[in-house]
């Protein structure tokens, strides 16, 4: 059983989707091993909790590993009323949380 | 709280072995997950290799996991009685020179690490 770290990307919500008055913003966590990771969400430094959701891929046939998409979703008006989105992952494989951010307008 | 100490570090030749030592000292029961890490100087602390201390829902209790720079050369264990996991590296190479660090979690899904130790340090002459 090898361990891989996830490599983690976080993507935010595009304008077509702003558009229809709603934002998805992704967390997703590439090739890792094994399957238990965690991810947490932080608006303006804020914990979040119970707006998003979590999708895990089976197995890669190729490699064993995992990946995993993490979406938190919000109004295009509590998107728009904060600047910094955050989600820090925790992984067997990381000696310490992974976080990955962008500010709002900025991207 | 739990407490690591690891001890076994030192100087050795390329080619050569070394066991560390990890003793845990404190509410040892509540550990379900031991590692092993080195961070050499001027990078990212690598995890190298882990053991399952108490058996969950997903893993058995001896169940060992390896990150790509320890699998083959290094082996993990742990005396559940002595409270002390072990890592034992054999063909070291210069490029193994490091501090090594034990870390525990009590997370049955082990996903961060709870407590660390100070570090030994692993030194590998050509």
């Known amino acids: 059983r090898t361990v891989a770290a996830p490599s983690v990307f976080i993507f935010p919500p595009s304008d077509e989707q702003l558009k229809s008055g709603t934002a998805s913003v992704v967390c997703l966590l590439n090739n890792f091993y094994p399957r238990e990771a965690k991810v947490q969400w932080k608006v303006d430094n804020a914990l979040q909790s119970g707006n998003s959701q979590e999708s895990v891929t089976e197995q890669d046939s190729k490699d064993s590993t995992y990946s995993l998409s993490s979406t938190l979703t919000l109004s295009k008006a509590d998107y728009e009323k904060h600047k910094v989105y955050a989600c820090e992952v925790t992984h067997q494989g990381l000696s310490s949380p992974v976080t990955k951010s962008f500010n709002r307008g900025e991207c | 709280q739990v407490q690591l100490q690891e001890s076994g570090g030192g100087l050795v030749q390329a080619g050569g072995s070394l066991r560390l030592s990890c003793a845990a000292s404190g509410r040892t029961s509540s550990i379900h997950l031991m590692a092993w890490f080195r961070q050499a100087p001027g990078k990212e602390r690598e995890f190298l290799a882990s053991?399952?201390?108490?058996?969950?829902?997903?893993?058995?209790?001896?169940?060992?996991f390896y990150g790509d720079s320890a699998e083959g050369r290094f082996t993990i264990s742990n005396d559940n009685a002595r409270n002390t996991g072990y890592l034992q590296m054999n063909s070291l190479k210069p490029e193994d020179t490091a501090v090594y660090y034990c870390?525990?979690?009590?997370?049955?899904?082990?996903?961060?690490?709870?407590?660390w130790g100070q570090g030994t340090q692993v030194t590998v002459s050509s």
């Open positions: 053991i399952i201390w108490t058996g969950g829902t997903t893993y058995y209790a001896g169940t060992t």
């Open positions: 870390a525990a979690t009590s997370l049955v899904n082990p996903t961060r690490y709870d407590y």
